[in-house]
Interface confidence: low
């Protein structure tokens, strides 16, 4: 059974993940981003079901494509360096989903834009956080 300290750690990790995802979304949605139209042409796979931490496997598998798209952004916000962001997200995702069980991610038939993809995982984080608090 999860202890209160492990629940708190999970909550903090989810909050960090949420912050990073929101930051990416803010960065690419910025009206000054000249590459947004081009970025929206990239397609991302969405999870068929994402209700548990193990489903973060679906996010992990899309981190490489996400980094490639973010490399187009060239944001003026120095801390939005794609390599750093994706590395941070990857560390958090690995800790949250655990490595005890191997989970095969199931994807929905329809692909999504980067904005839809990020919003989906932001909602996922918010949903799990709400069950922990």
């Amino acid at each position: 059974a999860p202890t209160s300290s492990s629940t708190k750690k999970t909550q903090l990790q989810l909050e960090h993940l949420l912050l990073d995802l929101q930051m990416i979304l803010n960065g690419i949605n910025n009206y000054k981003n000249p590459k947004l139209t081009r970025m929206l042409t990239f397609k991302f796979y969405m999870p068929k079901k994402a209700t548990e931490l193990k489903h973060l496997q679906c996010l992990e598998e899309e981190l490489k494509p996400l980094e490639e798209v973010l490399n187009l952004a060239q944001s003026k916000n120095f801390h939005l360096r794609p390599r750093d962001l994706i590395s941070n997200i990857n560390v958090i995702v690995l800790e949250l989903k655990g490595s005890e069980t191997t989970f095969m991610c199931e994807y929905a038939d329809e692909t999504a834009t980067i904005v839809e993809f990020l919003n989906r995982w932001i909602t996922f984080c918010q949903s799990i956080i709400s069950t922990l608090t």
Epitope: E15, L19, D20, Q22, M23, N26, K76, N77, F78, H79, R81, D84, L85, S87, N88
Partner: antibody, heavy 118, light 108 residues
Framework: EVQLVQSGAEVKKPGESLKISCKGS????????IGWVRQMPGKGLEWMGI????????RYSPSFQGQVTISADKSISTAYLQWSSLKASDTAMYYC???????????WGQGTTVTVSS | EIVLTQSPGTLSLSPGERATLSCRAS???????LAWYQQKPGQAPRLLIY???SRATGIPDRFSGSGSGTDFTLTISRLEPEDFAVYYC?????????FGGGTKVEIK
């Protein structure tokens, strides 16, 4: 445990050079930015700039560009802040801090007092 | 650069009272990019709040942050003796990072 340990207090004369250090431990030093913050006597905090020790990518606040140099030696997990010619107005407490990707400073060194006086 | 103005400059309160500190930005700051720090005399600052409202690891729940756009607030619900210190807000949404001038919370 994440720790940033800074070098000791310095007393210098105007025109002299100086290099202070900040050694990181308890985390992957090459994977986080290190920021430097100045606090003049009785005053607030001023962000000077940052370095990414993994590849020495460095960014400065316009107020400090050309006034100081930030560097790092990843082999010994240490970041540096240096001056080639100190002025009396450089007298301050200097802090190094680990800067998260998002931009907040989550772990701080204990600070290094620099006094410049003739 | 974004200028942050903190008010009041000094807040004189008694232990057990509620403290409300304000931070106003010269231009809109995404709430994901505002932090609060506590600094005690002779010590380095300590991160309290990031993302405007998320408490940093190990920070007691009497500390809470709120706000969006240009107006942000740090609230300490019941002041403990160890909470008397200087508090700084910081924006990290655009370069250069900037700090507010600080609010000193002192014992009345």
């Amino acid at each position: 445990e994440v720790q940033l340990v800074q070098s000791g207090a310095e007393v210098k004369k105007p025109g002299e050079s100086l290099k202070i250090s900040c050694k990181g431990s308890g985390y992957s030093f090459t994977s986080y930015w290190i920021g430097w913050v100045r606090q003049m006597p009785g005053k607030g905090l001023e962000w000077m700039g940052i370095i990414y020790p993994g590849d020495s990518d460095t960014r400065y606040s316009p107020s400090f560009q050309g006034q100081v140099t930030i560097s790092a030696d990843k082999s010994i997990s240490t970041a540096y802040l240096q001056w080639s010619s100190l002025k009396a107005s450089d007298t301050a407490m200097y802090y190094c801090a680990r800067q998260q990707v998002a931009g907040m400073l989550d772990y701080w060194g204990q600070g290094t007092t620099v006094t410049v006086s003739s | 650069e974004i200028v942050l103005t903190q008010s009041p400059g000094t807040l004189s309160l008694s232990p057990g009272e509620r403290a409300t500190l304000s931070c106003r930005a010269s231009q809109s700051v995404s709430s994901s990019y505002l932090a609060w720090y506590q600094q005690k005399p002779g010590q380095a600052p300590r991160l309290l709040i990031y993302g405007a409202s998320s408490r940093a690891t190990g920070i007691p729940d009497r500390f809470s942050g709120s706000g969006s756009g240009t107006d942000f607030t740090l609230t300490i619900s019941r002041l403990e003796p160890e909470d008397f210190a200087v508090y700084y807000c910081q924006q990290y949404g655009s370069s250069p990072l900037t700090f507010g001038g600080g609010t000193k919370v002192e014992i009345k």
